[in-house]
């Protein structure tokens, strides 16, 4: 089949990184600078994407693949091809499909990315809440009431929160 196709269409022999040049008797010509063809048999090369402004180059364009962009610090990509940049959320927020939203009561996020996580449940470890949680900070667990006798050790570190998921893109 490949051989038949080649006989019918000489352009099918042109590999990625080239185009079938009708102006030169359908010879396979290399893609000009700042252009690429990612598949064989193409009659034109595509213009390389330029990462400008808030977009910065993550991967340079080559003759066989387009450039890839990401966003400058403080911003993150939206979409598979990073077609838009969105400001990172503040601490105490999480990224949802509708943008940055404050953490619900009982949850926190101490980073500018990721999701809001539930406050540590001190009572599960037989401890009491020493410092209340906020949208930005987890609760601090202290010794249980029974441990508050003289000579008992003071604050224990909070139990590890559950692993944060990935923010939606």
């Amino acid at each position: 089949f490949e051989r038949t196709r080649s006989l019918q269409d000489p352009c099918s022999n042109c590999p990625a990184g080239t185009f079938c040049d009708n102006n030169r008797n359908q010879i396979c010509s290399p893609c000009p600078p700042n252009s690429f063809s990612s598949a064989g048999g193409q009659r034109t090369c595509d213009i390389c994407r330029q990462c400008k402004g808030v977009f910065r180059t993550r991967k340079e364009c080559s003759s066989t693949s387009n450039a890839e962009c990401d966003c400058t610090p403080g911003f993150h990509c939206l979409g598979a091809g990073c077609s838009m940049c969105e400001q990172d959320c503040k601490q105490g927020q999480e990224l949802t499909k509708k943008g940055c939203k404050d953490c619900c009561f009982g949850t926190f996020n101490d980073q500018k990315r990721g999701i809001c996580r539930p406050w540590t449940n001190c009572s599960l470890d037989g401890k009491s809440v020493l410092v209340n949680g906020t949208k930005e900070r987890d609760v601090v667990c202290g010794p249980s009431p029974a441990d508050l006798s003289p000579g008992a050790s003071s604050v224990t570190p909070p139990a590890p929160a559950r692993e944060p998921g990935h923010s939606p893109q």
Epitope: K52, G53, V54, L78, G81, S83, M84, E86
Partner: antibody, heavy 116, light 107 residues
């Protein structure tokens, strides 16, 4: 806060040129493309082009390619849009806008009136 | 160039009404669609970007949906301050292009 402040209204004669400025504040000017959009009286929005302040590179709408020049002065965080050979149908409000793939901040607009 | 067609071009509605504006692209623009609100004598304001993401400070009664070529802006319960003109705009390819606008007027 992030702000774009444009130069004041202009009245020009047909055939003349106009240069509108757009001063950015509250963010790193060189880090975002600046786009220009115009709106004729009672009409919709029309994209004119963009400049990358970091490099000075431009993209123009084919419709304006031979008449528009976009420049910038990074030392004063200002972008400029110059339109030459003005015609009466260039009478419009000209806006600059910061780009993130969407225009999140706009200037207040500059009315350019072309009249003999 | 990618053509953006908005409908209706104008509509009359009352406070509390649910309002839907549609925008159609002449080719696939994935989710690269933004919505702006403009009031007379003022610059446009970003409402929604990337089809459905609400810009900061925009009330949650505004929502966006769609993908590919067909998109919708919905105002769940129209408020007095929502009477304005709304524009869609694609960011898939240069030149950036806008829809013709939809003017939302008081019935």
């Amino acid at each position: 806060q992030v702000q774009l402040v444009q130069s004041g209204a202009e009245v020009k004669k047909p055939g003349a040129s106009v240069k509108v400025s757009c001063k950015a504040s509250g963010y790193t000017f060189a880090g975002f493309e600046m786009h220009w959009v115009r709106q004729a009286p009672g009409q919709g929005l029309e994209w004119m082009g963009a400049i990358d302040p970091k490099t000075g590179g431009t993209d123009y709408n084919q419709k304006f390619k031979d008449r528009v020049t976009m420049t910038r002065d990074t030392s004063i965080s200002t972008a400029y849009m110059e339109l030459s050979r003005l015609r009466s149908d260039d009478t419009a409000v000209y806006y600059c806008a910061r780009d993130l793939g969407y225009f999140d901040v706009w200037g207040q607009g500059t009315l350019v009136t072309v009249s003999s | 160039d990618i053509q953006m067609t908005q409908s209706p071009s104008s509509l009359s509605a009352s406070v509390g009404d649910r309002v839907t504006i549609t925008c159609r692209a002449s080719q696939d623009i994935r989710s690269n669609l933004n919505w702006y609100q403009q009031k007379p004598g003022k610059a446009p304001k970003l409402l929604i970007y990337y089809t459905s993401r609400l810009h900061s400070g925009v009330p949650s009664r505004f929502s966006g949906s769609g993908s590919g070529t067909d998109f919708t802006l919905t105002i769940s319960s129209l408020q007095p301050e929502d009477f304005a003109t709304y524009y869609c705009q694609q960011s898939e390819k240069l030149p950036r292009t806008f829809g013709g606008g939809t003017k939302v007027e008081i019935r």
